[in-house]
């Protein structure tokens, strides 16, 4: 017996173009949670029941509200580990599915709406009792960084948690460095010693003196990342330049990408571009299917007819969503606006409005321009369910009551100096520049580079 532990480090936009918009908005704050599903990783066991090794759901993360105009950051995460206890032997090779879910708040507080943001999967080799393994997985434009490990629960020990070792209360007859082991209590077990120099992060052993590598690492001591070296034999010490005497196989030679994936070299290794329906480091993981148990709340899973829809969930009454993840109640239609809380009183629904809003559906903005005065000659502007004061020159703040520093935004270009003035600001330009904001260079012949009329 033991526990698989998953630590999510970050979830946010991946590198490259097409960065996703934040899943939360100012009008619709949300929070994240994660679901992990584990299965034994051998292909002949693929037909096993969903999440045969177990599954876990994280706590909800902190509420996040998008800052308008800001790029989507890494999103705030739930505290703690996801722990999946396993009763039997740890299989050594396992498959995982990690889902990132969004719980929408705001209008839906009366009945939270859940939606699946990203799903990653992979197959890994992992010895119980080993160190944390780090991983990065991408799902569309999102990137998930996480670590995982499997550890045995006492009295289980070993790379599969199958041997029992219990300490004795009586003084041990075993010598130093040895420990008593049950059920063979008369025998003393030496702690497993791997080959000298075997990487503690990337290697493990099941027999004394061996060094077996975790996925992505190679070499006699598991210290070489797979496919990082293009050299079969390095140049001799006399050569100052790096390179190869004999051109070795490149990282894409022999195409490490399965299932029709195309390989491209990267500075450190290679990258597979997978066809639709496959993903993983080498396109080795096919799209999620009914065997992965993607339907929540008793939904019936039916295999889809095309690769774009590997499965369809038929939801029981009271649930909807592509994974039957949304509970349907009378607040699900979101009658309350502007972040109001929907309350089902039985005979009717009522909205409890946030401060600043009123009306049966919280549709009235109490702070709108109708009863709003902007000081110092400012004018009230409504829009998008909100309002603001457009302040006269020299004033700022919510109600234009604060004197603004017109120089705070450094309006003078090219090193010009800014001076606050009762009517606004004045720029004193550095030599060679002119204009109200010092924006135009003065050419040596005296003509300024003003834009053509």
């Amino acid at each position: 017996a033991g526990v698989f532990e998953l630590q999510i480090h970050s979830f946010g936009p991946g590198p490259g173009p097409g960065a996703p918009r934040s899943p939360c908005s100012a009008r619709l704050p949300c929070r994240l949670f994660f679901r992990v599903c584990l299965k034994p990783g051998l292909s002949e066991e693929a037909a096993e029941s969903p999440c045969a090794l177990g599954a876990a759901l994280s706590a909800r993360g902190p509420v996040y509200t998008e800052q308008p105009g800001a790029p989507a950051p890494d999103l705030p995460l739930p505290d703690g580990l996801l722990q999946v206890p396993f009763r039997d032997a740890w299989p050594g090779t396992f498959s995982f599915i990690i889902e990132t879910w969004r719980e929408e708040l705001g209008d839906q507080i009366g009945g939270p709406a859940w939606s699946l943001l990203a799903r990653v999967a992979g197959r890994r080799r992992l010895a119980a009792g080993g160190p944390w393994a780090r991983d990065i997985q991408r799902a569309g434009a999102w990137e998930l960084r996480f670590s995982y490990r499997a550890r045995c629960e006492p009295p289980a020990v070993g790379t599969a948690c199958t041997r029992l070792c219990r300490p004795r209360s009586a003084p041990s007859r075993c010598g130093p460095g040895l420990r008593p082991c049950a059920p063979l209590e008369d025998e003393c077990e030496a702690p497993l010693v791997c080959r000298a120099g075997c990487s503690p992060e990337h290697g493990f052993c099941e027999q004394p003196g061996e060094c077996r590598c975790l996925e992505g690492w190679t070499g006699p001591l598991c210290t070489v990342p797979v496919s990082t070296s293009s050299c079969l034999s390095p140049r001799g010490p006399s050569s100052a330049t790096t390179g190869c005497l004999v051109p070795g196989p490149g990282p894409c030679d022999g195409n490490p990408c399965a299932n029709g994936g195309s390989c491209s070299e990267t500075p450190r290794s290679f990258e597979c571009t997978c066809p639709r329906g496959f993903y993983g480091l080498r396109c080795e993981v096919s799209g999620v299917t009914c065997a992965d148990g993607p339907c929540f709340n008793g939904g019936l899973c039916v295999g889809g007819a095309d690769p774009d829809s590997a499965y369809i969930c038929h939801c029981p009454p009271g649930f909807q969503g592509s994974n039957c993840e949304k509970r349907v109640d009378r607040c699900s239609l979101q009658p309350c606006r502007n972040g109001g809380l929907c309350l089902d009183l039985g005979h009717a629904l009522r909205c409890r409005c946030r401060a600043g809003f009123a009306g049966p559906r919280c549709e009235h903005d109490l702070d709108d321009c109708a009863g709003r005065a902007c000081a110092n000659g400012g004018t009230c502007v409504e829009g998008g369910g909100a309002h603001r004061c457009s302040c006269a020159l020299g004033f700022g703040g919510r109600d234009c009551r604060e004197r603004a520093d017109p120089c705070a935004a450094r309006p003078c270009a090219h090193g010009g100096r800014c001076y606050a003035h009762f009517s606004g600001l004045v720029c004193a330009c550095a030599p060679g520049y002119m204009g109200a904001r010092c924006e135009f260079p003065v050419h040596p012949d005296g003509a300024s580079a003003l834009p053509a009329a």
Partner: antibody, heavy 120, light 107 residues
Framework: EVQLVQSGSELKKPGASVKVSCKAS????????MNWVKQAPGQGLEWMGI????????IYNHKFKGRFVLSVDKSSNTAYLQISSLKAEDTAVYYC?????????????WGQGTTVTVSS | DIQMTQSPSSLSASVGDRVTITCHAS??????MGWLQQKPGKAPKGLIY???NLEDGVPSRFSGSGSGADYTLTISSLQPEDFADYYC?????????FGGGTKVEIK
């Protein structure tokens, strides 16, 4: 005066699509949900689904998922029911019916109904 | 889904008769139900909401009562214009469901 005016009768071939409209007037369109109800010839009433015109959020009867899509156009105060891949069993009268979004009232006003006939 | 069992499925009555139609829900619906009237070739029309409240413009001879899972529509003195189909509907839970209908015919 509250009125829900539906589009006219439709005769369609199997496999075709149809879009039934329901134009609302006399009340604030976004304050009331819109229900859609099917009545097959000689049969009773069957609830298909509901849409919140303010947010566009929909809930469907699980018997009417997939080929049936509810939508609204707030600018014209119109709700729509679209049915694709029509089958003979879709032959029916389809009604829109408004409902207060806080459920203080049931379906108080109904459209006159749109007859959809599916026949080869 | 909540089943709405309506009875009788049809009845014959004379003008001036007192008519009672019942509806039983498969679970408690806390008064979240209504009664509709439908005349041949016409759209349904709301009569009663929340089990007992008359919609605007509905004559006072119509009344509704009940709680929990059992509800009743009563027409105290049947009028010629009342010959029609009557349906109960629950809106306590999605999907909304209708009773099978009661046809009120002239005896």
């Amino acid at each position: 005066e509250v009125q829900l005016v539906q589009s006219g009768s439709e005769l369609k071939k199997p496999g075709a699509s149809v879009k039934v409209s329901c134009k609302a007037s006399g009340y604030t369109f976004t304050d009331y949900y819109m229900n859609w109800v099917k009545q097959a010839p000689g049969q009773g009433l069957e609830w298909m689904g509901i849409i919140n015109p303010y947010s566009g959020v929909t809930i469907y009867n699980h018997k009417f998922k997939g080929r049936f899509v509810l939508s609204v156009d707030k600018s014209s105060n119109t709700a729509y029911l679209q049915i694709s891949s029509l089958k003979a069993e879709d032959t029916a009268v389809y009604y829109c019916a408004r409902q207060d979004s806080l459920l203080d009232y049931a379906m108080d006003y109904w459209g006159q109904g749109t007859t959809v006939t599916v026949s080869s | 889904d909540i089943q709405m069992t309506q009875s009788p499925s049809s009845l014959s009555a004379s003008v001036g008769d007192r008519v009672t139609i019942t509806c039983h829900a498969s679970q408690g619906i806390s008064g979240n139900m209504g009664w509709l009237q439908q005349k041949p070739g016409k759209a349904p029309k709301g009569l009663i909401y929340h089990g007992a409240n008359l919609e605007d413009g509905v004559p006072s001879r119509f009344s509704g009562s009940g709680s929990g899972a059992d509800y009743t529509l009563t027409i105290s003195s049947l009028q010629p214009e009342d010959f029609a189909d009557y349906y109960c509907v629950q809106y306590a839970q999605f999907p909304y469901t209708f009773g099978g209908g009661t046809k009120v015919e002239i005896k």
